[in-house]
């Protein structure tokens, strides 16, 4: 008998408004997997330590993934 | 204006089923999650149940697990709650309530309420 | 499901300070947040996160968290601040919601 599979992703609502990169104290990225069938982006905010799920799919979204992953390289020697 | 409006409440007989609606109106709906809450007479809040922004989510409490169904339909900006199987200690004052939108799930805009009694 | 823990009972002389706590595992890794509901009516809420008011929540109302504990404070109590209050987070699963049993304030 196959296992059944339970769906759980952690993110049960979305921003999509721009978020500042200064402000921000961690970025995951959570792939898409067998537990959860869509990419999640939770953002830990510097001010209070509290996290907010972003949408991959908002353009002020990506824009902030791209501003993060330059600012990422530019460290790395 | 910011506001969910219920609908649905009534008096139904033990092993009968009930669906109930929660509109909304003055934000983007598809963007957040959605709860149900209810109260028994003279009792604290109890958590029911969750959907997730898109509806591929859901979640229960285990007391409704197998008996009730949370859905929501974005495109008429309303959230549901099939209740089949009811029982006597289901009767409550139920609310919809607005996913805050942070981490932490918590209800920052609730319905008026509306009241279920289940009896024969 | 993992529970948290109210005094049932608080009371407060008008004017003074109050502070409502809540215990629980679960707020090791979720912040709490706080409701207030007065007979025959919804509940509100007053704080979330990391001592969030909504708008239209007087600044007397204010919440921190340590360890397992939130608290909620209302700093100068007014006799509209009598009401029950509930405290609520995300619980040790991360899936389900736990409410506390409720803390019936009286102001004196």
């Known amino acids: 008998v196959p296992l059944s599979r339970t769906v759980r992703c952690t993110c049960i609502s979305i921003s999509n408004q721009p978020v500042n990169p200064r402000s921000l104290e961690k970025l995951e990225i959570i792939p898409a997997s067998q537990f959860c069938p869509r990419v999640e982006i939770i953002a830990t905010m510097k001010k209070k330590g509290e996290k907010r799920c972003l949408n991959p799919e908002s353009k002020a979204i990506k824009n902030l993934l791209k501003a993060v992953s330059k600012e990422r390289s530019k460290r790395s020697p | 204006e910011v506001q969910l409006v219920q609908s649905g409440g009534g008096v139904v007989q033990p092993g009968r089923s009930l669906r109930l609606s929660c509109a909304a109106s003055?934000?983007?709906?598809?963007?957040?999650?959605m709860h149900w809450v209810r109260q028994a007479p003279g009792k604290g809040l109890e958590w029911v149940a969750v959907?997730?922004?898109?509806?591929?989510?859901?979640y229960y409490a285990d007391s409704v697990k197998g008996r009730f169904t949370i859905s929501r339909d974005n495109s008429k900006n309303t959230l549901y709650l099939q209740m089949n199987s009811l029982r006597a200690e289901d009767t409550a004052v139920y609310y919809c309530?607005?996913?805050?939108?942070?981490?932490?799930?918590?209800?920052?805009?609730w319905g008026r309420g509306t009241l279920v009694t289940v009896s024969s | 499901s993992s529970e948290l823990t109210q005094d049932p009972d608080v009371s407060v002389a008008l004017g003074q300070t109050v502070r409502i706590t809540c215990q629980g595992d679960s707020l090791t890794s979720y912040y709490a947040s706080w409701y207030q509901q007065k007979p025959g009516q919804a509940p509100v809420l007053v704080i979330s996160g990391n001592d969030n008011r909504p708008s239209g929540i007087p600044d007397r109302f204010s919440g921190s968290n340590s360890g397992n504990t939130a608290s909620l404070t209302i700093t100068g109590a007014q006799a509209e601040d009598a009401a029950d209050y509930y405290c609520g987070s995300r619980d040790s699963s991360g899936y389900q919601v736990v409410f506390g049993a409720g803390t019936k304030l009286t102001v004196l």
């Open positions: 959907i997730s922004y898109d509806g591929s989510n859901k």
């Open positions: 309530a607005k996913d805050g939108g942070w981490y932490d799930w918590y209800f920052d805009l």
């Open positions: 003055g934000f983007t709906f598809s963007s957040y999650g």
